[in-house]
């Protein structure tokens, strides 16, 4: 299935390309997958199709959903799907995992950070760049076309970099921001802001009352030896050791693993004889190192039994 995830923030422009490629002369039709309703091509609409591109000018949270594009040629039709999620603007600085584009690595010799997705937009230089929400200032930072160059890269330069630019459509301007992590490589590996692999944030796990269940907290911290990298569980914001419930135990020790060369750490929370009151608790997976802390929350729900007549 030719499907592509795209995401954006409300009140910003979002442009999505059909995941099925074809000659620019081919006709591309866009539809709301749920309703099969055709998306208009007239530019006066807030959401409109423009060949291979689907434009949200600006995007709204309600635009989230799956969109179908069909590339039509004289001899074949190709279908693709764009899975679009529009998020509310975050009140604080931290950019959540789900708004991050792919991580890029740099070294003293090569420290280019490309602004993600910018090629889809009609923008004019210069780009604005921010690190951990602070505008970048100083001669070490140079904005070149669609990328940022950092001179004399140091490990402190690792962090989340956001590019901000203006998309122009028929004289109207729309803001766009995109964020990606930048890591600094050295011979001994590197460490980065913790990335939690499991659980997904705000996940719900179905459990059977009276049975045992395990919750795994798994996070990656960088490449090579990692220092002060810890994963742990909290219950309702408290340490497991402060929570006097012998049925709920975090396994002793932490398993180190290497995933795609990344150093990852896991710990398992074991809940014996699940009770109703366990469904009321908030289970937080915390991953921390000297770069910072990330927290993902999971809750338990009663497994629904589907009765077949």
């Amino acid at each position: 299935k030719f499907s592509k995830q795209s995401w954006g923030l409300e009140n910003e422009a979002l442009i999505v390309r059909c995941p099925r490629q074809g000659k620019s002369s081919y006709i591309v039709d866009w539809y709301y997958s749920q309703t099969n309703k055709s998306i208009p091509t007239q530019e006066r609409n807030r959401v409109f199709a423009s060949g291979q591109l689907l434009k949200f000018l600006p995007a709204e949270v309600a635009d989230s959903g799956i969109y179908t594009c069909i590339v039509r040629s004289p001899t074949f039709n190709r279908t693709g799907y764009a899975n679009v999620t529009i998020y509310k603007k975050q009140p604080d600085c931290n950019v959540p995992d789900y708004l991050m584009y792919s991580t890029v690595s740099g070294s003293e010799k090569n420290s280019k950070i490309y602004c993600p997705t910018i090629d889809l937009y009609n923008w004019t230089a210069p780009l604005e760049w921010f690190k951990n929400c602070q505008a970048l200032q100083g001669s070490r930072y140079k904005a070149h076309k669609s990328f940022l160059v950092i001179d004399n890269v140091m490990t402190d330069d690792a962090g989340d970099y956001t590019c901000k630019f203006i998309h122009n459509e028929n004289g109207a301007n729309y803001s766009v921001t995109a964020t990606r992590s930048f890591t600094v490589k050295d011979e001994q590996g590197f460490s980065l802001f913790p990335v939690i692999r499991a659980p997904a944030h705000n996940e719900t796990k179905e459990v059977e009352i009276g049975e045992n269940t395990n919750l795994t907290c798994s996070a990656c911290f960088g490449k090579g030896a990692q220092f002060l990298a810890t994963v742990q569980w909290q219950l309702n914001g408290n340490k497991i050791t402060d929570f006097s419930e012998p049925r709920i135990q975090q396994e002793e020790g932490q398993n180190q693993s290497f995933s795609n060369g990344l150093a990852c750490v896991n710990t398992v929370l074991r809940i014996a004889d699940v009770k109703e009151e366990d469904l009321l608790l908030r289970y937080d997976c915390l991953a921390l190192n000297l770069h910072g802390l990330r927290r993902h929350t999971i809750r338990l729900s009663r497994k629904h039994h589907h009765h077949h007549h």
Epitope: N94, N132, D156, S191, A225, L228, T230, H291, G292, L293
Partner: antibody, heavy 116, light 107 residues
Framework: EVQLVQSGAEVKKPGESLKISCKGS????????IGWVRQMPGKGLEWMGI????????RYSPSFQGQVTISADKSISTAYLQWSSLKASDTAMYYC?????????WGQGTLVTVSS | EIVLTQSPATLSLSPGERATLSCRAS??????LAWYQQKPGQAPRLLIY???NRATGIPARFSGSGSGTDFTLTISSLEPEDFAVYYC?????????FGQGTKVEIK
């Protein structure tokens, strides 16, 4: 410019409570750990604990667990170190430090004197 | 906890001389070791991180080496402003710990 500005020197009596502060500026306060370090008169540095202001998660050195409380108010970019009942042995210089992968920026220090 | 032992406690040298400071860990800390300089009445200043990386703005006369349990801070040619107390710090395991310090004084 990254800066950590600590509150002024304090003179207290044993048994009194105290809260000293460390205000961060010039960077995203919620995105970096703040650590507290004690230095008793004529002695070395002792790591007390850290807080992640974006989440208010704290971690203490075992020697200081239960002796002090570290907190933060991210709305005013300020971290705190507090005692509920001071002892003469708490007399020291206290430093806060930003941890950006390392203790890279330090406050100027707050001298706390506890004497009857 | 990991104990760091610095030696010597005091080093008496003249400007222009080479200073060699040692820091030994009670167990391996890989390369998770930093060095700080502290002058009287001032906050510590980061010199070296990850055992051998100079922090921003630190002169090239300061260098760090070692890994595992044995580390060295070398000042190739002492300047008058280098006379101070130097601390090593490990950040390999909780709790973070400092050495007791080495005082570099003018002979």
């Amino acid at each position: 410019e990254v800066q950590l500005v600590q509150s002024g020197a304090e003179v207290k009596k044993p048994g009194e409570s105290l809260k000293i502060s460390c205000k961060g500026s010039g960077y995203s306060f919620t995105s970096y750990w703040i650590g507290w370090v004690r230095q008793m008169p004529g002695k070395g540095l002792e790591w007390m604990g850290i807080i992640y202001p974006g989440d208010s998660y704290t971690r203490y050195s075992p020697s200081f667990q239960g002796q002090v409380t570290i907190s933060a108010d991210k709305s005013i970019s300020t971290a705190y170190l507090q005692w509920s009942s001071l002892k003469a042995s708490d007399t020291a210089m206290y430093y806060c430090a930003r941890i950006g992968g390392m203790f890279d920026y330090w406050g100027q220090g707050t001298l706390v004197t506890v004497s009857s | 906890e990991i104990v760091l032992t610095q030696s010597p406690a005091t080093l008496s040298l003249s400007p222009g001389e080479r200073a060699t400071l040692s820091c030994r860990a009670s167990q391996s800390v890989a390369n998770a070791l930093a060095w700080y300089q502290q002058k009287p009445g001032q906050a510590p200043r980061l010199l070296i991180y990850k055992a051998s990386n100079r922090a921003t703005g630190i002169p090239a006369r300061f260098s760090g080496s070692g890994s595992g349990t044995d580390f060295t801070l070398t000042i190739s040619s002492l300047e008058p402003e280098d006379f101070a107390v130097y601390y090593c710090q490990q950040y390999y395991g909780w709790p973070i710990t400092f050495g007791q310090g080495t005082k570099v004084e003018i002979k």
